[in-house]
């Protein structure tokens, strides 16, 4: 029982994790202006995201621009769009593998192949975690990097936006949750032995022996 | 007193490079970075890109991608830009200057300019 | 990349005139403007930095002011010694970009 509800707490984790990977992904604001140096009332502050860019006027105005060629964009952030759908793409696929594997369904009798399946989609979600986690630390790095680069002019300079820390928290919760999928598995797994020494023992030769005869010291 | 002591006239071919140095002093070198400007005759300045001299980092205006290369000796607290492919166009006043700390900026010291003649 | 216009390339002055030079970029440069003066045969020396601070050592004559696109320098009574050519450069955005010049001279 106790399983079942580790095993809920974490598919619920990871689907959080998903939809808040989700939001960082599409959001534009994975880079925001950093406007520094003489205090200076902004007119506008620029947002950038990996499919867009937004300016906000000081009125409250805000025009979106999608980017326009694939090629021409850096490397970094063709990098990490690539990622963060992939990272996307891999948590679902995590999540078909629960399904079939979980308590609940009947896509698998076996509980022990119930189990390998749970197992499996904790690991998948483990890996979309550390996918959504490489983009964002990616990018934060950068924006640290060019703000404390005296080279970079001030209007280059960038802060790190509301979908990073979005995306840190949704690979926290897919790490965290496939973490769980994969604790629960040990019981799981457990009924894997029993199961298999059931079918043994009914193919074993009629004659048995009394439980004095069987040495104590293999019982834990 | 921060003092940039570059150095003296250059006359070279078309074709050939040449590399011009900055010696600086009255400041520690890796605190500040150091940019190039040049300036054609009778005309504005043109900013032609900046060194760190704490960990060798460059950047370059556009313009002057795969003309000019900036390079530092940290031992001799001086800084280098060799210019390549020299024509007509790159003879002009070369000028060396100290990029301000942080929150200023802008060029503070200048050297005193190297001349560069390209003529055949 | 920004482009900064000074309208006037040369002024020709009176002693103890007042001198406006005025710099406007194509887009907001958030204060972030210097302004050097240029001597003949001589590298550029910094007035002023940050649009309207200036900089040790040079005389209060000198002042700067304005915001947003458009800066001015002024020098309130001009000087045999303020015979130079007078630049402006954003320090804003890269590749940063100087002002044409203005000359100024004495009538």
């Known amino acids: 029982m106790a399983s079942a509800g580790m095993q809920i707490l974490g598919v619920v984790l990871t689907l959080l994790g998903w939809v808040n990977g989700l939001v960082s992904c599409a959001l534009p604001m994975w880079k925001v202006t950093a406007f520094i140096g003489n205090s200076i009332v902004v007119a506008q502050v620029v947002w950038e995201g990996l499919w867009m860019s937004c300016v906000v006027q000081s009125t409250g105005q805000m025009q979106c621009k999608v980017y326009d060629s694939l090629l021409a964009l850096p490397q970094d952030l063709q990098a990490a769009r690539a990622l963060c759908v992939i990272a996307l793409l891999v948590a679902l696929f995590g999540l078909l593998v629960y399904l079939a594997g979980a308590k609940c369904t009947t896509c698998v009798e076996e509980k022990d192949s119930k189990a390998r399946l749970v197992l499996t989609s904790g690991i998948v979600f483990v890996i979309s975690g550390v996918l959504t986690l490489i983009p964002v630390c990616w990018t934060a790095h950068a924006i640290i990097r060019d703000f404390y680069n005296p080279l970079v002019a001030e209007a280059q300079k960038r802060e790190l936006g509301a979908s990073l820390y979005l995306g840190w928290a949704a690979s926290g919760l897919l790490l965290l949750g496939g973490g769980l999928l994969c604790c629960t598995c040990p019981s799981g797994g457990s009924q894997g032995p029993s199961h298999y020494m059931a079918r043994y023992s009914t193919s074993a030769p009629a004659i048995s022996r009394g439980p004095s005869e069987y040495p104590t010291k293999n019982y834990v | 007193e921060v003092q940039l002591q570059q150095s003296g006239p250059e006359l070279v071919k078309p074709g050939a490079s040449v590399k011009i140095s900055c010696k600086t002093s009255?400041?520690?070198?890796?605190?500040?970075?150091m940019h190039w400007v040049k300036q054609s005759h009778g005309r504005s300045l043109e900013w032609i890109g900046g060194?760190?001299?704490?960990?060798?980092?460059?950047i370059y205006n556009q313009k002057f991608k795969g003309k000019a290369t900036l390079t530092v000796d940290k031992s001799s607290s001086t800084a280098y830009m060799e210019l390549r492919s020299l024509t007509s166009e790159d003879s002009a006043v070369y000028y060396c200057?100290?990029?301000?700390?942080?929150?200023?900026?802008?060029?503070?010291?200048w050297g005193q300019g190297t001349t560069l003649t390209v003529s055949s | 990349d920004i482009q900064m216009t000074q309208s006037s390339s040369s002024f020709s002055v009176s002693l103890r005139d007042r001198v406006t030079i005025t710099c406007k970029a194509s887009?907001?440069?958030?204060?972030?403007l210097a302004w050097y003066q240029q001597k003949p045969g001589n590298a550029p020396r910094l007035l002023i930095s940050g649009a309207t601070s200036l900089e040790t050592g040079v005389p209060s004559r000198f002042s700067g002011s304005g915001s947003g696109k458009d800066y001015t320098l002024s020098i309130t009574s001009l000087q045999t010694e303020d015979v130079a050519t007078y630049y402006c450069?954003?320090?804003?955005?890269?590749?940063?970009?100087f002002g044409g010049g203005t000359k100024v001279e004495i009538k």
């Open positions: 887009e907001d440069i958030y204060n972030r």
């Open positions: 200057a100290r990029r301000g700390g942080y929150g200023n900026f802008n060029f503070d010291y």
């Open positions: 060194i760190n001299p704490n960990n060798g980092d460059t």
């Open positions: 450069q954003q320090y804003w955005s890269s590749p940063y970009t």
């Open positions: 009255g400041y520690t070198f890796t605190e500040y970075t």
